[in-house]
Interface confidence: low
Amino acid sequence: MEQRGQNAPAASGARKRHGPGPREARGARPGPRVPKTLVLVVAAVLLLVSAESALITQQDLAPQQRAAPQQKRSSPSEGLCPPGHHISEDGRDCISCKYGQDYSTHWNDLLFCLRCTRCDSGEVELSPCTTTRNTVCQCEEGTFREEDSPEMCRKCRTGCPRGMVKVGDCTPWSDIECVHKESGTKHSGEVPAVEETVTSSPGTPASPCSLSGIIIGVTVAAVVLIVAVFVCKSLLWKKVLPYLKGICSGGGGDPERVDRSSQRPGAEDNVLNEIVSILQPTQVPEQEMEVQEPAEPTGVNMLSPGESEHLLEPAEAERSQRRRLLVPANEGDPTETLRQCFDDFADLVPFDSWEPLMRKLGLMDNEIKVAKAEAAGHRDTLYTMLIKWVNKTGRDASVHTLLDALETLGERLAKQKIEDHLLSSGKFMYLEGNADSAMS
């Protein structure tokens, strides 16, 4: 069951062991996965964490985690809790990991279970995360992960260099194997010189790249860039402006669950991402990507829930001029603020639309099944599914994605009710951007 309100960092789960004990496996991927430099960094962090673990106090934990005094509670076996559990802060209880969200593989004295790995794009999930086993991810067909670059799956070569024959196929953990025809010795795996390449598909490391190709590529890129800038200014400017004029950058989900390292900064809206990537094709520093809210926004009106009620059903003409955006009233994290409202959605969205809505939002049937199994009761099912959606999508889980999905399903009344509820609760308010006045 979802542990609501749990926002203590997962890192604080490691604490000094009472004695030698089995080490927790961080991931369950076949083959090496962690860069060697990262191992050193992690080791250093763990040393710091274990040294400072004594400083963790009740204030560090959300109220829901503080165990009230209770008599005759079951105690961990020799100071350790079994796989699928972690130890409570007072060291007297074993608390279960959450199925599909976190896990522990051995008897342990972790204060928090380890977060489940989420397979990257380009990977397939061989087996899901359980409370006692991490997700097992594997590179997709035609790609592999090697020791030198365990962070990502690389495309397998499509053929061997001249004078070599293929003796091993592409597997998720190795590239094709080539040996010299005469000697039978293995090829080192380095990319062969261009003129040696026998077969290769464009885009693979072994693909030939002539000077004329570079010139054509640069020319095409320049033309595309000019066209893109023009299109942005003329057609998409109005759509993007509200974001540039002060919407909080998306951030978030449940802080314990969402792996922030895998999130793109400022991924609040696809349109914005597309335009940023067109206008700034090179690497953009994070602080530039973050869309800051101006102290005194020009052409932007903040409306309180009361003032905004008359705007709930605007004319289509006005809708084309303005994009009314719901933003947290207290300038908090949009996804986290939305998450706090999930409890009430079960009463606002018809039961028959729960599963279609979650599919529309991107949950797989198996994830929906797991959520239903985890839910405390019938009414809790939508909450659990929405939490799964937030954990899965991170920053992309915005209030607008949810409202748009309801609109697409034809649940306009539910959409309206949720919008009203978000406003009347005081948690959200409208950020009203007038495209024309702001452009000038």
């Epitope: 069951m1 542990q3 009230a68 079951s74 559990h85 279960s96 099944k369 985890e374």
Partner: nanobody, 122 residues
């Protein structure tokens, strides 16, 4: 006071079957995951099988296809049907339940039964 009471253990010949039961009693609000663990003499306690409230199951590789875990939520009872038993299945089998008590809000406390001995021998 929450109690887990196991039953059904005993002596059985290799290839035979046994059905273990575990009943939860006492005052509590909800049982989350339930599972069976086993501990052979001189070894660690290992997970045998686990089941969520909705019936999603997870088994140790060594028992897959031979053991079946099930539960009756209305009776707060857990079962383990053990078929094709082998001598290496000999162990004390412990019932485990993650129980929600009101004082803990959304934190489940881990409770154990006293254990029931299963001996597989000819």
């Amino acid at each position: 006071e929450v109690q887990l009471l196991e039953s059904g253990g005993g002596l059985v010949q290799p290839g035979g079957s046994l059905r273990l039961s575990c009943a939860a009693s006492g005052t509590f609000d909800k049982i989350n995951n339930m599972g069976w663990y086993r501990q052979a003499p001189g070894k660690q306690r290992d997970l045998v099988a686990q089941i969520t409230p909705g019936g999603i199951t997870d088994y140790a590789d060594s028992v897959k296809g031979r053991f079946t875990i099930s539960r009756d939520n209305s009776k707060n009872t857990l079962y383990l049907q053990m078929n094709s038993l082998r001598p290496e299945d000999t162990a004390v089998y412990y019932c485990n339940a993650e129980i929600l008590k009101r004082a803990y809000i959304d934190v489940y406390v881990n409770y154990w039964g006293q254990g029931t001995l299963v001996t597989v021998s000819s």
